[in-house]
Interface confidence: low
Amino acid sequence: LRLLDHRALVCSQPGLNCTVKNSTCLDDSWIHPRNLTPSSPKDLQIQLHFAHTQQGDLFPVAHIEWTLQTDASILYLEGAELSVLQLNTNERLCVRFEFLSKLRHHHRRWRFTFSHFVVDPDQEYEVTVHHLPKPIPDGDPNHQSKNFLVPDCEHARMKVTTPCMSSGSLWDPNITVETLEAHQLRVSFTLWNESTPYQVLLESFSDSENHSCFDVVKQIFAPRQEEFHQRANVTFTLSKFHWCCHHHVQVQPFFSSCLNDCLRHAVTVPCPVISNTTVPKPVADYIPLWEPRSGSSDYKDDDDKGSSHHHHHH
């Protein structure tokens, strides 16, 4: 969690002199309670926006917007604390709006916005706006919270952000899977324009239950420049058991920009029903190198029968 690096953070608006400050997420009013405190924010809205850094990088940001209730408590409103909590890491980042002048009622409802919290793809956050000073321990709460889910890198707008492009979101491997004679499976995919190794992982399941019955991993050498955007082929020799027929193939690149955390692409080949002609179903997930798959058994097999284009072991 971090703040977008460029431009001075602004919270002033006509009729209000305001400054944005870093916050420890523990406002002084917790320690020194006040008797008179403002009411809670109204209509808290969180939206996904996109912003450029000074370097020209594009990042997803949380656009936070809320309004004030039209009651007399605005006379005691000294500012607001904005808190963003990343749910899977418990990491929290806060900023404080400090009002340098008193608020007055005017002809329209007071509205505040902040769009400087950088968020990560495929992450969930809890966004809280606390009005300051915070209430005494037994007082009514004067904050509002909302959860905010950031789309993953498959999302059209997200795909072109710097974190997604760094993880390989622009690469479309166009994976095809072909069942050959003699228990073989040929996987083809388009190489990206970088001399980087790839790993192709095959896991097979039985049709009747979600039971992993076969595993193979193949590595592919980093292609030479003249091979960029060409098709790479890997041939796997499958399990001899006819019931071990539901195949899940993943292609994992090791681009220099993401290394252990590159976006993987996968296709699933179901067991044949009538004919062997199957249409692979594309899926993609976002896993680090050290967790080859989520929710399935460990590799049991790494036989190198069959052939592979650019065949390579790290």
Epitope: E91, F254, I287, L289, W290, R293, D298, D302
Partner: antibody, heavy 118, light 107 residues
Framework: EVQLVESGGGLVQPGGSLRLSCAAS????????MNWVRQAPGKGLEWVSF????????YYADSVKGRFTISRDNAKNSLYLQMNSLRDEDTAVYYC???????????WGQGTTVTVSS | DIQMTQSPSSLSASVGDRVTITCRAS??????LAWYQQKPGKFPELLIY???TLQSGVPSRFSGSGSGTDFTLTISSLQPEDVATYYC?????????FGPGTKVDIK
């Protein structure tokens, strides 16, 4: 020069807390997953926790789950381990380590010593 | 969780001897195995990754082999500077468990 430097170790009473830091330099920290590994006096290596490059995936050893929190600040090139409810058996040298593409951990810090004792 | 075991737990050999350390996983882990050397008072150093690939800068007398559940680290000609504890580690999925270690010294 690729370097990891741990800090924050010290003596703490059982039930206490400590926050370890690991400062990375000489490589693009934001591209790498990171790990904490510990070694109790006279014992072997024990993997403690893993965090992926953008904090999207986090794992803990069963022995520390619910007590330790791994985090990172890519803008500061820093890795952290917040250790709460510390026990005697958490006494160890704590290393941060960078995974290598293809496997293993190829860059290690020099370690920071945590002693839990009353 | 997958358990990692190493044998022997310690060994003594003469300079120039061929030394073999084995590491066994309780379930198959393909070639997702690394070997480390740790000298007394020092941090561990990566020797081998992907079961058999020598880490850059590591002397060629070290080699690794195996796949699935059984792995071997071999020192073809033991040198005085090889006195250390050697650990295997699996990294196919969390937890990324280490073996208990094998202490190697010179007779």
């Amino acid at each position: 020069e690729v370097q990891l430097v741990e800090s924050g170790g010290g003596l703490v009473q059982p039930g206490g807390s400590l926050r370890l830091s690991c400062a990375a330099s000489g490589f693009t920290f934001s591209s790498y997953s990171m790990n904490w590994v510990r070694q109790a006096p006279g014992k072997g290596l024990e993997w403690v926790s893993f965090i992926s490059a953008r904090s999207s995936t986090i794992y803990y050893a069963d022995s520390v789950k619910g007590r330790f929190t791994i985090s990172r600040d890519n803008a500061k090139n820093s890795l952290y381990l917040q250790m709460n409810s510390l026990r005697d058996e958490d006494t160890a040298v704590y290393y941060c380590a960078r995974p290598k593409v293809g496997g293993g951990m190829d860059v290690w810090g020099q370690g920071t010593t945590v002693t839990v004792s009353s | 969780d997958i358990q990692m075991t190493q044998s022997p737990s310690s060994l003594s050999a003469s300079v120039g001897d061929r030394v073999t350390i084995t590491c066994r996983a309780s379930q198959g882990i393909s070639n997702y195995l690394a070997w480390y050397q740790q000298k007394p008072g020092k941090f561990p150093e990566l020797l081998i990754y992907a079961a058999s690939t020598l880490q850059s800068g590591v002397p060629s007398r070290f080699s690794g082999s195996g796949s699935g559940t059984d792995f071997t680290l071999t020192i073809s000609s033991l040198q005085p500077e090889d006195v250390a504890t050697y650990y295997c580690q699996k990294y196919n999925r969390a937890p990324f468990t280490f073996g208990p270690g094998t202490k190697v010294d010179i007779k």
